[in-house]
């Protein structure tokens, strides 16, 4: 799992000038088996907000025990609180489930800050506002944790939707989605629409608010506008992609594109921020500062620590630039770009100033583990995790926050050469040489 401002711990080289457009591909992607245009029962099945994660209601065991589960595309374990904890309203009680099976194996997951540990087992799992199926899935019953559960977040577990390679304790523990696809006719695809509020929500509003949709097994066309553009999944562990160019207000950062993907770039719904490698972060902040130079903000703001407040309704969105990430396309030498607004990368924060203020944290931060396209990015887009075709699709979200002057965008194609060179190859560690 990723470190840094990561829930639940918590927030182009060789490219030709990209103004040149290729002819638009006219043929839409063929409909996949079992894929429908509308999934009414799954729309609006997520709640929460970017700062504390988005969760879906799930049931575990027989008779079913209802729990809220954080949707996390940056990990691969299904893990639920299974013992009393001050931050949990409820937890999984294995002894009450007639279908629980103990795997007699422990699991320990440490983070940079905090950890969770528990006992592995299997049980029957379903998603009330999901496909009408029940599957036997691996469950890590969390018995002990530190800085994992979040006070007031309203979720009691985590659904890791990435691949088996990063499952704990090892890749032999089949992730939930793999079990779902194997045991049912659900297509090997899911899509996420995370809807950032754009304004702070108090506790009662969060509990009553709609946070978005997780469409399991398909794509709902009502959740996006325009076209879906797909980027290849580089490797099936995290949802790893390749960024080939970065622009701030249309100005190229002009870095070797390998820097953008050092040591990887992933799409992670369990991380709050857009996290960038150190060099990229520094260049991006310098560029954002320059673009917004009519106002100055303290260093602590750019570090994501201090809040900046404006009188309610007067946030000067126009002084902050748009940010574009160009992603490798499906066609050779073709890329597309996704563009986010300050409404995505300035995260509203509640309860700090007066009700007459709108306060925000800068939600772009530094990473030592590569680029993480967290909720800040995902809240602008409908994101399709097309595992069957090893690709991730982006389209403008029907619920993204914008103003009358600018909107998030997904545009292409653009000519970009030598995109394969943008990927960083993580050296394979020879375990025999590791010091113990």
């Amino acid at each position: 799992t990723q470190h840094g401002i990561r829930l639940p711990l918590r927030s182009g080289l060789g490219g030709a000038p990209l103004g040149l457009r290729l002819p638009r591909e006219t043929d839409e992607e063929p409909e996949e088996p079992g894929r429908r245009g509308s999934f009414v029962e799954m729309v609006d099945n997520l709640r929460g907000k970017s700062g504390q994660g988005y969760y879906v209601e799930m049931t575990v065991g027989s008779p079913p025990q209802t729990l809220n589960i954080l949707v996390d595309t940056g990990s691969s374990n299904f893990a639920v609180g299974a013992a009393p904890h001050p931050f949990l309203h409820r937890y999984y009680q294995r002894q009450l489930s007639s279908t629980y099976r103990d795997l007699r194996k422990g699991v320990y997951v440490p983070y940079t800050q905090g950890k969770w540990e528990g006992e592995l087992g299997t049980d029957l799992v379903s998603i009330p506002h999901g496909p009408n199926v029940t599957v036997r899935a691996n469950i890590a019953a969390i018995t002990e944790s530190d800085k994992f559960f979040i006070n007031g977040s309203n979720w009691e577990g985590i659904l890791g939707l990435a691949y088996a390679e990063i499952a704990r304790p090892d890749d032999s523990l089949e992730p939930f989605f793999d079990s779902l696809v194997k045991q049912t006719h659900v297509p090997n695809l899911f899509s996420l629409q995370l809807c950032g509020a754009g304004f702070p929500l108090n506790q009662s509003e969060v509990l009553a608010s709609v946070g978005g949709s997780m469409i399991i097994g398909g794509i709902d066309h009502s959740l996006y506008t325009g076209s879906l553009w797909y980027t290849p999944i580089r490797r099936e562990w995290y949802y790893e992609v390749i960024i080939v160019r970065v622009e701030i207000n249309g100005q190229d950062l002009k870095m070797d594109c390998k820097e953008y993907n050092y040591d990887k770039s992933i799409v992670d719904s369990g991380t709050t921020n857009l996290r960038l490698p150190k060099k990229v972060f520094e260049a991006a902040v310098k560029s954002i500062k320059a673009a917004s130079s009519t106002e100055k903000f303290p260093d602590g703001f750019w570090l994501g620590e201090q809040l900046v407040c404006w009188q309610a309704g007067t946030t000067p969105w126009n002084i902050f630039p748009v940010i574009s990430l160009y992603l490798m396309g499906e066609v050779t030498n073709q890329s597309f770009r996704i563009t986010i607004l300050p409404q995505q990368y300035l995260r509203p924060v509640e309860d700090v100033a007066t009700s007459q203020d709108d306060c925000y944290k800068f939600a772009i931060s530094q990473s030592s583990t590569g680029t993480v396209m967290g909720a800040v990015i995902m809240e602008g887009f409908y994101v399709v995790f097309d595992r069957a075709r090893k690709r991730i699709g982006f389209a403008v979200s029907a619920c993204h926050v914008h103003d009358e002057f600018r909107t998030a965008a997904v545009e292409g194609p653009f000519v970009t050469l030598d995109m394969e060179d943008c990927g960083y190859n993580i050296p394979q560690t020879d375990e025999s040489t590791l010091m113990t």
Partner: antibody, heavy 120, light 108 residues
Framework: QLQLQESGPGLVKPSETLSLTCTVS??????????WGWIRQPPGKGLEWIGN???????YYNPSLKSRVTISVDTSKNQFSLKLSSVTAADTAVYYC????????????WGRGTLVTVSS | EIVLTQSPATLSLSPGERATLSCRAS??????LAWFQQKPGQAPRLLIY???NRATGIPARFSGSGSGTDFTLTISSLEPEDFAVYYC??????????FGGGTKVEIK
Amino acid sequence: QLQLQESGPGLVKPSETLSLTCTVSGGSISSSSYYWGWIRQPPGKGLEWIGNIYYSGSTYYNPSLKSRVTISVDTSKNQFSLKLSSVTAADTAVYYCARLGHGYNYFDLWGRGTLVTVSS
Amino acid sequence: EIVLTQSPATLSLSPGERATLSCRASQSVSSYLAWFQQKPGQAPRLLIYDASNRATGIPARFSGSGSGTDFTLTISSLEPEDFAVYYCQQVYVWPPRTFGGGTKVEIK
């Protein structure tokens, strides 16, 4: 070294507009390293932030005073000014101008203050 | 809204004694907190910024500590000129706006 000096009438009638000017000497108000601000202190009471301004003209105001406050800057005169409209006796205070330094975070240099009394 | 509560309201001490002043925030302000000294008829003077850094020209007997919600200003050995009112201010929420109510350090 850099100094700040407040100036303006010491007596203002209720419902009128209080106007004060802060003159910056020994340095440039156009420095990109600072905001400039106003703080007030009613007699025998604590400090209340009024607002800040950057040399570009960008302003921030205390929400509780926002509807009555205007802060402006005149870089050619190396001055910034405060206007507070519709004053009442509750606006009687010592008014300080100050420099917001240390990365725009802390009031590190203050004027001596000027007492403004609101009375008819 | 973040509220800063200073205690005690008044501290009566003799020169040479150690003074410990407290500032408590209603929610975490990280280490974005300052301390000011104000003598009668004078403007406030910045003593400490970022919770523990002494401002230019401030004697070493003044020290600040704390982070999150609880902060302390310590004057290791009171000098006659240290008897004054002390204010804390948070800048976690920017622009800086919230001052504490003040602690008066008076001669016993």
